[in-house]
């Protein structure tokens, strides 16, 4: 008996798609061996049509795929644009076609519905609109027009020209009689329900000379589109419901048990708590289409999703819908990275962001998720040297450590920095990840003075006190600018006196600026790192003023003033800030990046669109 299992019989109609799931024992050998789908010949051979090693027969080109799900021991064969020629006996299997690890599948493709004995067939999707056209002769032009539905043996009146409407159709049906030139009336039914399907008869006149026309209405449930995404990655659901619902509330819901569909997000402002911080509903286009982006995919996100339109913002009978079956691949290419990073007020965090290592030259971005309305994610910093004005001097995006990870450092933390942030690039949109920054009780580990004033032409020494917990770390000073933080020479001044209960391993490391010039004004950071991995940082603003008295300045912690609240930007920086993002590929699918910058604060365009692994802000 073969351990492979699947459907013995598959039936479909021409033009449709099938999705055949084959199950295998998920041993490590089975998980990684070749998977195939082959057609059995009359003489017993089995000709491969598609395999997991990339082979696709010319018969299947552009209309089939095979996806392996090693973690649950299944592979799925999708075949689209079926024709009657596809009917036959197949095998799905593992290894080599001629060996026994396979399962026999019979596929039967029948002819699609057509015109039957003068019956016009209308095939319409659930929730959409159908127009049933009913011709009549001149002698019946002034007579009653009506539409009946065949229920069992009896025709039941649905609507007529005297104003009757069957209660099942109230508010969603009308009868239109064309102008005198056209001998035609039509019945328009909106918000089609599954129960509307069936045989209809339209009639003009009531006597033996009446004109009759049969109609067969087929209401289709949407075939769910299969979507396969990696754990920790991102998925985008594009929902195009048509211009007729452009002004109706939109929703995305996830089917739970049975008929229930729990709202994930809708345009009325509802959002499921499980998706807080990791979902965006993009503003809709004029044609009513919209998209929903979900990042930080979890195992429990797998399931069936429906998008639709209804004034209630949730699934109701007659809602036009689109469906997806989301599979979350646990053997993910996206590496684990902390989903929660903690920092203290006044301290800092260093966030590691994964990206597709094949796209090392892509532009990297970091944005702050905002939950208001449908969610948005205004950009804060990018790898091309742009930083949002309010974050000047305390935010930096570094390409290190590279090879699939970049680093974002944020310091001078306040409680307002708590929230969800997204890491993303202008390349692979599946690699958007989410991190939550939490501000916890505690003191910053690094101690530096507040704002410092240097005197032109003199020497300035700025101290940074490192506690003993960082004894094994590399300590550095750097000057912040919008492209990063350029390392500067610093001096180890021996043990620090700034820490109670801290031994000789604490350190005082000073930055010395000789012969200060105007160019030395700006933000300076001291910090710790291990190789290319960054830890805590602390920021000091150095102002430069005219000489008042000779000598050098040595700043101590006691002399420190509070850091300035605001800085006036120089014109060059403001120009960079107000420059529109030129790269058209960035979030092209969400149409999110446009020159919609708020000129007042220089804010960048925004991406409109758990059980946490935690990382402290102070170490790695």
């Amino acid at each position: 008996k073969s351990p492979i299992f699947g459907p013995e019989e598959v039936n479909s109609v021409e033009g449709n798609s099938v999705s055949i799931t084959c199950y295998y024992p998920p041993t490590s050998v089975n998980r990684h061996t070749r998977k195939y789908w082959c057609r059995q010949g009359a003489r017993g051979g089995c000709i491969t049509l598609i395999s997991s090693e990339g082979y696709v027969s010319s018969k299947y080109a552009g209309r089939a795929n095979l996806t392996n799900f090693p973690e649950n021991g299944t592979f799925v064969v999708n075949i689209a644009q079926l024709s009657q020629d596809d009917s036959g006996r197949y095998k799905c299997g593992l290894g080599i076609n001629s060996r026994g690890l396979s399962f026999d599948v019979s596929l039967e493709v029948s002819q699609g519905p057509g015109l039957l004995n003068d019956t016009k067939v209308y095939t319409v999707d659930l929730g959409r609109t159908v127009t049933i056209n009913c011709p009549f002769k001149t002698e019946n032009a002034q007579k009653r027009k009506s539409l009946y539905k065949q229920i069992g043996l009896y025709p039941v009146l649905v609507i007529d020209s005297s104003g009757y409407v069957n209660p099942n159709y109230t508010g969603r049906i009308r009868l239109d009689i064309q102008g005198t030139g056209q001998l035609l009336f039509s019945v328009v039914i909106n918000q089609l329900r599954l129960s509307d399907a069936g045989q209809y008869l339209c009639q003009a006149g009531d006597d033996s000379n009446s004109n009759k026309k049969n109609a067969d209405l087929q209401v289709l449930k949407p075939e769910p589109e299969l979507v396969y995404e990696d754990l920790r990655g991102s998925v985008t659901f594009h929902c195009a419901l048509g211009p007729e619902v452009a002004n109706v509330a939109k929703f995305l819901c996830r089917q739970s048990s049975g008929e229930n569909c729990d709202v994930v997000v809708n345009t009325l402002g509802k959002r499921a708590p499980a998706f807080e911080g990791r979902i965006l509903l993009n503003p809709q286009d004029k044609d009513g289409s919209f998209s929903v982006v979900i990042t930080g995919l979890r195992k429990e996100d797998a399931g069936r999703y429906l998008c639709g339109a209804h004034s209630d913002g949730q699934l109701q009978e007659g809602s036009p819908i689109q469906a997806w079956q989301l599979f979350v691949n646990e053997e993910s290419t996206i590496p684990r990275s902390p989903t929660v990073v903690k920092g203290v007020a006044g301290g800092s965090v260093a966030v590691l962001c994964p990206y597709n290592r094949k796209e090392s030259k892509s532009i990297k971005y970091w944005c702050l998720w905002e939950g208001a309305q449908n969610g948005r994610c205004p950009l804060l910093v990018d790898s091309e040297g742009w930083v949002k004005a309010q974050y000047e001097g305390r935010l930096s995006l570094l390409e290190e450590p590279g090879n699939g990870t970049f680093t974002v450092i944020l310091n001078q933390l306040t409680s307002r920095d708590a929230g969800f942030y997204w890491c993303l690039t202008n390349g692979d949109t599946l690699w958007r990840t989410t991190v939550e920054i939490k501000i916890i009780e505690g003191e910053p580990n690094l101690k530096v003075p507040g704002n410092v004033t240097a005197v032109l032409g003199e020497t300035l020494k700025v101290p940074c006190h490192f506690p003993c917990k960082f004894s094994s770390y590399e300590k550095y000073w750097c000057k912040w600018n919008n492209t990063g933080c350029q390392a500067l020479p610093s001096q180890d001044e021996g043990p620090s006196k700034a820490f109670v209960n801290c031994d000789e391993n604490s350190r005082l490391v000073s930055l010395t600026l000789n012969l200060v010039t105007r160019a030395d004004e700006g933000w300076y950071w001291c910090g710790v790192k291990q190789g290319h991995f960054y830890g805590e940082t602390a920021a000091v603003y150095v102002a430069v003023e005219e000489r008042k008295a000779a000598g050098s300045r040595d700043v101590s912690l006691a002399k420190a003033d509070a850091a300035p609240d605001e800085k006036v930007l120089d014109s060059g920086f403001r120009e960079i800030e107000n420059k529109a993002i030129q790269d058209p590929r960035l979030f092209a699918e969400e149409k999110a990046v446009a020159d919609t910058r708020d000129q007042a604060d220089g804010s960048r365009a925004s991406v409109d669109s758990g059980s946490s692994e935690e990382q402290g802000g102070s170490s790695r």
């Epitope: 449709n16 659930l126 769910p224 049975g258 399931g303 069936r304 699934l315």
Partner: nanobody
Framework: EVQLVESGGGLVQAGGSLRLSCAAS????????MGWFRQAPGKEREFVGA??????????YYEDSVKGRFTISRDNAKNTVPLQMNSLKPEDTGVYFC?????????????????WGQGTLVTVSS
């Protein structure tokens, strides 16, 4: 909420036939899967067959021991899933349950189903 009700069970001689039916009521959207399982006294519930559908496509699954003897189908008009059982054997005796789910899961597993009927007893005498 979805309710499932099985019917058609009874006593039959070996070699005979029975037609069970699983009627579903309640609202459903999108695809659906219905599975037939049986449970002999003192034994675990075991898979017999299943049918799932999505749009105009239907998929039928059978346990090896019933292949060629049992046929699962779907009656759209009545919203039922009949199980036609021919050439019945004494080892086919048990309570037959139908289960329903809207998820795409392994149809052989009882854990794949969200809804269950109360069961109908089939006794095959020798």
């Amino acid at each position: 909420e979805v309710q499932l009700v099985e019917s058609g069970g009874g006593l039959v001689q070996a070699g005979g036939s029975l037609r069970l039916s699983c009627a579903a009521s309640g609202r459903t959207f999108g695809s659906y899967s219905m599975g037939w399982f049986r449970q002999a006294p003192g034994k675990e519930r075991e898979f017999v067959g299943a049918i799932s559908w999505s749009g105009s496509s239907t998929y039928k699954y059978y346990e090896d021991s019933v292949k060629g003897r049992f046929t699962i189908s779907r009656d759209n008009a009545k919203n039922t899933v009949p199980l036609q059982m021919n050439s019945l054997k004494p080892e086919d005796t048990g309570v037959y349950f139908c289960g329903g789910t809207m998820e795409r899961r392994d149809p052989r597993r009882t854990s794949a189903y969200d809804y269950w009927g109360q069961g109908t007893l089939v006794t095959v005498s020798s």
